[in-house]
Structures are given as structure tokens and as C-alpha cells.
């Protein structure tokens, strides 16, 4: 599972994979997270005078057992990779380091007025990975107010030194802040002849593109398909670069596919994981473990939960199948990619989803089998992400529902805060079934930060989404845990098993219910929903649910709560209860905010906030 704790004055002995320089433990942890085999790291923040060359050393480590012996070392900070940590996985690093010179290959020196301009220059340069800025007080006049753009083979500094009046930092391309823009073009039957920086084996050009995007020096790629004439190059993904940052004109070549890194994209950046399962394909590699499961998706889930697993093969051969299921072979390699890909086997292969930012945070993969108008009483722990948002003025009242999406995050509807946008008056209760069980002693969460979508306007229906950052992180229990968020790619997924929950009215002129209600409701296509609501605009950021004959629906008091659908064995938060004309009326579906349409916004808000949260909690 996800382990976020840092161990001060602790060094892990052995298990060494690689050593790099990073400015702090957080960046070291990030590097470990994205390294295909790294599970543990040790960072030397302080070293004795004789070992100054080891200061800022980031030692990436692996372990078959998932742990290593710890030794006491003053100034060392150790911890775990954030593989399997969902929301917290991000390549973005905004921190600025005063008094540090992050060294590398200086390829450009420009005059800028301030550090922000320097960082922007780096973010908008193809080759820049990190930078150093000399302030106006720097001891060498010729370098004052100069911005040095840098790169290295690893993407990290070649060394780091303390230096007065120097400030260093990283490019913000991985924060989706580059203004370069990114060509999404995929060139079929074309190859780029430029310089190769690395090569990996991939099943298709899309995985190749994602690997290129997260490789420190890849700007574009050429992938050779299984039909390519040279056998040794079949399924090989060549990661490439050039001095100009742009590829030379593509050369026509049968069975070659080329394209660009998406690092400089502002919106369409891929996740650092590959979710597709490839049928009839065999990913070869070192075998880690074998288990018997029912279905390739369960095999993928098993791989995801096994932290060292990088990819898997699920075999359907008769000799590989038993009563409890078929053979699921969990595998790994040095670079995280298969050592060879072959075709025609009976079964499927795919990758671990341990680096997926959201879709598969293991915390939320709970397999739960599953007034709402026309609903029934829920049972304790059945919908552990459901919370009650209550306002405490003279008395305390339930106003809205919400969904836990992280230890410190609740997702709800913006309209819940119409007229009451004051964090102090709200109390949030999780892990409860009946509102009557809430007493003065019942623990509640308070709002640290209320983030209402900037485009939301009262009464106008759109952008009905809000994030609540809690003052203190939640403890996950059997009755209180997060719901998985969809990915942006899930906007067209067809869901067939959807449920809405809440303590809202059970009839139009009703009252709040004591026991949490649940109801299964079919989704209604937007075009059909629009016909039912001729007075309103049903846009693609909305999703509708309801029975043609009515009778089952969300209602007043359910607002902000979840519309969840079970997909591939996992519950996902598909909608946020938003609005309706009456409740449970014939031909009047309930309307929900479509969560997949807001994934960029959710990520932007939770990540920009979480960077600060990590910074303060580990200082």
C-alpha cells in the first residue's frame, strides 16, 4: 500500500539501485517513485565535512521484502516511493531552492529580472530541465541577474553545491505550465532519423509516447510495429531528441509510427501509467510471482497491488487454468518494460497501474457489493466515501452530501455553499449511517480550504463542483475511505451499475432522512435528457440518471453527494448530485455534475495545494 512517512536521521542499508543528486528529500522521493524498481530511498541532507560530495545524495533502493535494515545517520532522511499513492503521484515540482547551485550542462545564459522569469524561461525551453539564477548580490558581477538553463542525462543535477545569492529550481513543464504547446500528431508509416537517447520495448505507439513524455530527455519518438522487417527492432520504441528540439522531417517508412512527447502539453498530459490490456500478447520479463485469478482485469489489479510488479501475463491455456482461475504471472524488468513482446498466445498482458494518479489509488479499490426517492436503507460501511455536510449556526443541520476522494479531500457540489461560503460554520461527518447517531462527541472534520469552481454561478447550473480541503487528514477505516475518481478518458465509458446515495428528501415536499438511503438508477444519454429538459441546457459537463417512469431519484438534501458506478470491479465517482425538476417525476431525470469532465480541475487544485501540504508536513 501507500506509505508516505519520512524517517529522519535514518538511512536504509543496501538494496542500491542508483545514486543521483536532488535538492531535498521530496524530490528524491519523486525520483524514486518514477524509477521502475525503486521502492525505498535515503537522502543525505547533512553530511560530515569529509563527505561533502555525498551531501544532497539521493540513494534509490529496492528490496524483495519491501523493506531494508535501517541505520541511524544524522542528517539522513529516508522513506518509501509513492508508487500506489494515487493523488500524490506527480512529476511536478514547484519548489525554489535559495542558496543552492544545481549543476549540470549550462546550455543557455540569459539576463532576467527575477527568479520567476528564469523559471518561466526554463519551462518554455525544450531542453531545460533545471536552472540556476544569480541574484543582483552574487559575488561575480558578470553573472548577476543571469539565468542559467541546464540539463543532464538523468534530468537531475550532476552535483549540488551551497552558494550564496544563487537560486535553483526545476522546469515546470511537468506541471502542465509550458507555453510551448504540444503537437498531438501521430505519423503513421513515418520515422524520425534524429538522435536516439534510449530505447524500450512497448506494445504500441501510445505506450511509447507516454514513456517518452516521462523520460527526461525524450522530445519525440519512433515506434516500430510487430510487422517491421528487422526482427530485433519489432516493438521497439526509440526515444529521441535533437538540438533544435524539433524532429527532422519524418522519413516514409512502412510499419513505423512517430510522434512527440506530451511533456509540453497544457491539458492533454498522459498519466504515468498504461491501463490498456493487450489480448493475445505476451510480455516477457523476470517472473516475480504466480497466482490464479478470474480475468485479466483481476490479474492487472493483483499486479497493481503487488508493488514490485511492473507488468503481467494472464494465460488462458487449459493447462494454466484451475478451479479458482487461470494463471496470472506477475513480472518485472530493469527498465519497467517487457524484455520481449510476442503475439498469438492464449491470454492477455498489461501493465501495473501503480503509477496511475487517480484511477487506481489502491485505497479506493474497495469491492463493495452493492432518500433518495424510491430508495432503501443503506448499511454501515456500504458507501464508505459518503459524508454529511452540516451547517452549525444556532443548531446543526444536514445540508448536503459529499464524497471522500483523499485523506484531506472531499468533493461536493458548489451550490451547497450558496449563501454560506464560510468554512468555519461547516462540519463534515464520515463513517456514519444515521444522522441521529451524531452527538457533541462525534468526531467531525473542519474545512481548511473551500475551493468552489471559479466559473460557478448561483442558479445557473454549470460548474457545480467544489473541493473541500480538510484541516486534518482522515483516518481510513472500514466505514470511512475514499472513492476512486474516473480518468479524463472515462468521459465516454458506458456504465450499467450506478447508485445514488444520500440523506435527502424521500418525496418532493419531504424532509431529511435519518438513515442513509441508496437507490440504483440507470444513466440517461445527454441527448435524451435534453429532450426532457427543454427549458435547460444539458451540457457535456452534466450527466443524467433516472427511470423513464420516475419513482427513483435524488432529491433536496442529496446535493453534493455521489453518483457511483461499478466498472471493471471497482466503484468510481461518476457524478455529483446537482439538480432536478421535482424528485422522481416521470421523464424528469436527476442531473449530476460529470466528474470525468473536471479531472484537470480536480488535479490542479489538489496538487497545487498538496505540494504546499507536503512541504509543511515534512519540514
Amino acid at each position: 500500500g501507500c506509505m508516505t512517512q519520512l524517517y529522519k536521521n535514518t538511512f536504509f542499508r543496501g538494496g542500491d539501485l542508483a545514486a543521483i543528486y536532488t535538492p531535498d528529500a521530496q524530490y528524491c522521493q519523486k525520483m524514486c517513485t518514477f524509477h521502475p524498481r525503486c521502492l525505498l530511498f535515503s537522502f543525505l541532507a547533512v553530511t560530515p565535512p569529509k563527505e561533502t560530495n555525498k551531501r544532497f545524495g539521493c540513494f534509490m533502493k529496492e528490496s524483495i521484502t519491501g523493506t531494508l535494515p535501517r541505520i541511524h545517520r544524522t542528517g539522513a532522511i529516508s522513506g518509501h516511493s509513492l508508487k500506489q499513492c494515487g493523488h500524490q503521484i506527480s512529476a511536478c515540482h514547484r519548489d525554489i531552492y535559495k542558496g543552492l547551485d544545481m549543476r549540470g550542462s549550462n546550455f543557455n545564459i540569459s539576463k532576467t529580472d527575477n527568479i520567476e522569469e528564469c523559471q518561466k524561461l526554463c519551462t518554455n525551453n525544450f531542453h531545460c530541465q533545471f536552472f540556476t539564477y544569480a541574484t543582483s548580490a552574487f559575488y561575480r558581477p558578470e553573472y548577476r541577474k543571469k539565468c542559467l538553463l541546464k540539463h543532464s542525462a538523468s534530468g537531475t543535477p550532476t552535483s549540488i553545491k551551497s552558494a550564496d545569492n544563487l537560486v535553483s529550481g526545476f522546469s515546470l513543464k511537468s506541471c502542465a505550465l509550458s507555453e510551448i504547446g504540444c503537437p498531438m500528431d501521430i505519423f503513421q508509416h513515418s520515422a524520425f532519423a534524429d538522435l536516439n537517447v534510449s530505447q524500450v520495448i512497448t506494445p504500441d505507439a501510445f505506450v511509447c509516447r507516454t514513456i517518452c513524455t516521462f523520460h527526461p530527455n525524450c522530445l519525440f519518438f519512433t515506434f516500430y510495429t510487430n510487422e517491421w522487417e528487422t526482427e530485433s527492432q519489432r516493438n521497439v520504441c526509440f526515444l529521441k531528441t535533437s538540438k533544435s528540439g524539433r524532429p527532422s522531417p519524418p522519413i516514409p517508412q512502412e510499419n513505423a509510427i512517430s510522434g512527440y512527447s506530451l511533456l509540453t502539453c497544457r491539458k492533454t498530459r498522459p498519466e504515468p501509467c498504461h491501463s490498456k490490456i493487450y489480448s493475445g500478447v505476451d510480455f516477457e520479463g523476470e517472473e516475480l510471482n504466480v497466482t490464479f485469478v478470474q480475468g485479466a482485469d483481476v490479474c492487472q489489479e493483483t499486479c497493481t497491488k503487488t508493488i514490485r510488479c511492473q507488468f503481467f501475463i494472464y494465460s488462458l491455456l487449459p493447462q494454466d487454468c484451475k478451479e479458482e482461475g487461470c494463471k496470472c504471472s506477475l513480472r518485472l524488468s530493469t527498465d519497467g518494460s517487457p524484455t520481449r513482446i510476442t503475439y498469438g498466445m492464449q491470454g492477455s498482458s498489461g501493465y501495473s497501474l501503480r503509477l496511475c494518479k487517480l484511477v487506481d489509488s489502491p485505497d479506493c479499490t474497495t469491492k463493495i457489493n452493492a432518500r433518495i426517492v424510491g430508495g432503501t436503507n443503506a448499511s454501515l460501511g456500504e458507501w464508505p466515501w459518503q459524508v454529511s455536510l452540516q451547517v452549525k449556526l444556532v443548531s446543526q443541520t444536514h445540508l448536503c452530501g459529499g464524497s471522500i476522494i483523499g485523506r484531506q479531500w472531499v468533493l461536493t457540489a458548489a451550490h451547497c455553499f450558496d449563501g454560506i461560503p464560510y468554512p468555519d460554520v461547516w462540519r463534515i461527518y464520515g463513517g456514519i449511517l444515521s444522522l441521529s447517531e451524531i452527538t457533541k462527541e462525534t468526531p467531525s472534520s473542519r474545512i481548511k480550504e473551500l475551493i468552489i469552481h471559479q466559473e460557478y454561478k448561483v442558479s445557473e447550473g454549470n460548474y457545480d463542483i467544489a473541493l473541500i480541503k480538510l484541516q486534518t487528514p482522515l483516518n481510513y477505516t472500514e466505514f470511512q475511505k475514499p472513492i476512486c475518481l474516473p480518468s479524463k478518458a472515462d468521459t465516454n465509458t458506458i456504465y450499467t451499475n450506478c447508485w445514488v446515495t444520500g440523506w435527502g428528501y424521500t418525496k418532493e415536499q419531504g424532509e431529511t432522512q435519518n438513515i442513509l438511503q441508496k437507490a440504483t438508477i440507470p444513466l440517461v444519454p445527454n441527448e435524451e435528457c435534453q429532450k426532457k429538459y427543454r427549458d435547460y441546457v444539458i451540457n457535456k459537463q452534466m450527466i443524467c440518471a433516472g427511470y423513464k417512469e420516475g419513482g427513483t431519484d435524488a432529491c433536496k438534501g442529496d446535493s453534493g453527494g455521489p453518483l457511483v458506478c461499478k466498472h471493471s470491479g471497482r466503484w468510481q465517482l461518476v457524478g455529483i448530485t446537482s439538480w432536478g425538476e421535482g424528485c422522481g417525476r416521470k421523464d424528469q431525470p436527476g442531473v449530476y455534475t460529470k466528474v470525468s469532465e473536471y479531472m484537470d480541475w480536480i488535479l490542479e487544485k489538489t496538487q497545487s495545494s498538496d505540494v504546499r501540504a507536503l512541504e509543511t508536513s515534512s519540514a
Epitope: V458, E460, Y536, K556, S559, S578, G580
Partner: antibody, heavy 128, light 109 residues
Framework: EVQLLESGGGLVQPGGSLRLSCAAS????????MSWVRQAPGKGLEWVSV????????KYADSVKGRFTISRDNSKNTLYLQMNSLRAEDTAVYYC?????????????????????WGQGTLVTVSS | DIQMTQSPATLSLSPGERATLSCRAS??????LAWYQQKPGQAPRLLIY???NRATGIPARFSGSGSGTDFTLTISSLEPEDFAVYYC???????????FGPGTKVDIK
């Protein structure tokens, strides 16, 4: 206490223009749809125009479409009606009214159904 | 467009009597119907919304009923201040806006 106060009415020649204002107080103006409703002397009520809380959406009766423009300034809690190309049949008392939502509608998308508060009206006379 | 008709055009009654006013829509308006009272020289005042819900501050002698196309406003016992013109109104399909009935005048017999 909710209050709506219209101003800007008067005598104008056919083809002329006039701008009506409605100053609102006693409620959160930016949360509500607002409308203009008129009443010709001795006649019934006729809805003229409506504007959404943010001002992003407007609708007009066919009789005034293309000639009248509704707008609002939420920072000043004021509703406006710009009337151009005025005709004799536009002579009426013009009321500013707050849009009330149905108890049945819930959530973030509230269309106005009724007019729960009205101003006292301002008389517009179009005559040569 | 949905047309609204009101009957009778005039209702002559004495204080203390029961008044029954009718409003008919040319097609169903569900329960989305309101009643207003207007006295000479004054702005209209909302009495009933959603066909049967009394607006804030409206006395209990006023009640509304009906749904679909036929609606009724009842004043159980007329008070002197109730003599006025009463309008029904529906919000027809949103792009079309709002439609008022022609009104029923309740005057003293």
C-alpha cells in the same frame, strides 16, 4: 426587507430611447434572476424580459426583441432596461420583479417560475 | 405558445362570501402556476406559487389547487381588502418566458 425601486420613466417620442433602472436591496441581488414586467393603462400584465443572476443569459418577449436590452450590475445591485425604437404601444407602467424559484426545483440550476417581489413601477409614455 | 384564460372576467361578491376563481392553460403546465393580487395603483403581489403553496405573509384564507391545465384560487371568506384584480401566471417553455392570464376582477356587490 426586500425592496425594488424603479426609476427612469417619463415621456418620450416614438423612435426615441429610454433607460430604466431598478435599485435592489434587502437580499443577495447576484443570486436571483430578475425581470421586467409591464402593464399598459387599464390592461393586464405582460412579461418583457428576464436576466440570469450573472447576467450571462437573457430572454425577451417577442414584442420587444431587438429593441430592448436587459442588463444588470451586481456590484451596484441594479437592474437596467435599455429601450430603443420606442413605439406608442410600449406605453405602460414598467415593473421590476425578482424571479422566484419553484419549491419543486432543487439544486444548482434554478429557473425562475414566478415573481415573488415587485417594485412600485415607473411610467413610460411614448407619444408625439 | 401556451395561452391562459381566466373566468369569470368579473366576480361580484360581498365581504364574508367565498370566492372561486378559475384559470385554464391551453396545455399542461404541471404544477407551475402562480396567482397574484393587484389593487388599483399598486404593484402585483404574489399570493400562491406551485399551484397550491402560499407565499410568505399571505393569509390562510387564500388557497390554490389544481394541476395540469385547470387551476383554482379560493378565498374562503372575503375581507374588504381582498377586492382587487387577480392574475394567474405560468412559466411556459423557458425560451418563451412567462404568460399571464387576462385577470379576474373581484368587486363588491
Amino acid at each position: 426587507e426586500v425592496q425594488l425601486l424603479e426609476s427612469g420613466g417619463g415621456l418620450v417620442q416614438p423612435g426615441g430611447s429610454l433607460r430604466l433602472s431598478c435599485a435592489a436591496s434587502g437580499f443577495t441581488f447576484s443570486y436571483y434572476h430578475m425581470s421586467w414586467v409591464r402593464q399598459a393603462p387599464g390592461k393586464g400584465l405582460e412579461w418583457v424580459s428576464v436576466i440570469s443572476p450573472s447576467g450571462g443569459s437573457t430572454k425577451y418577449a417577442d414584442s420587444v426583441k431587438g429593441r430592448f436590452t436587459i442588463s444588470r450590475d451586481n456590484s451596484k445591485n441594479t437592474l437596467y432596461l435599455q429601450m430603443n425604437s420606442l413605439r406608442a404601444e410600449d406605453t405602460a407602467v414598467y415593473y421590476c420583479a425578482r424571479g422566484g424559484s419553484s419549491d419543486y426545483a432543487w439544486g444548482s440550476y434554478r429557473r425562475p417560475y414566478y415573481f415573488d417581489y415587485w417594485g412600485q413601477g415607473t411610467l413610460v409614455t411614448v407619444s408625439s | 405558445d401556451i395561452q391562459m384564460t381566466q373566468s369569470p372576467a368579473t366576480l361580484s361578491l360581498s365581504p364574508g362570501e367565498r370566492a372561486t376563481l378559475s384559470c385554464r392553460a391551453s396545455q399542461s403546465v404541471s404544477s407551475y402556476l402562480a396567482w397574484y393580487q393587484q389593487k388599483p395603483g399598486q404593484a402585483p403581489r404574489l399570493l400562491i406559487y406551485d399551484a397550491s403553496n402560499r407565499a410568505t405573509g399571505i393569509p390562510a384564507r387564500f388557497s390554490g389547487s389544481g394541476s395540469g391545465t385547470d387551476f383554482t384560487l379560493t378565498i374562503s371568506s372575503l375581507e374588504p381588502e381582498d377586492f382587487a384584480v387577480y392574475y394567474c401566471q405560468q412559466r411556459s417553455n423557458w425560451p418563451r418566458g412567462f404568460t399571464f392570464g387576462p385577470g379576474t376582477k373581484v368587486d363588491i356587490k
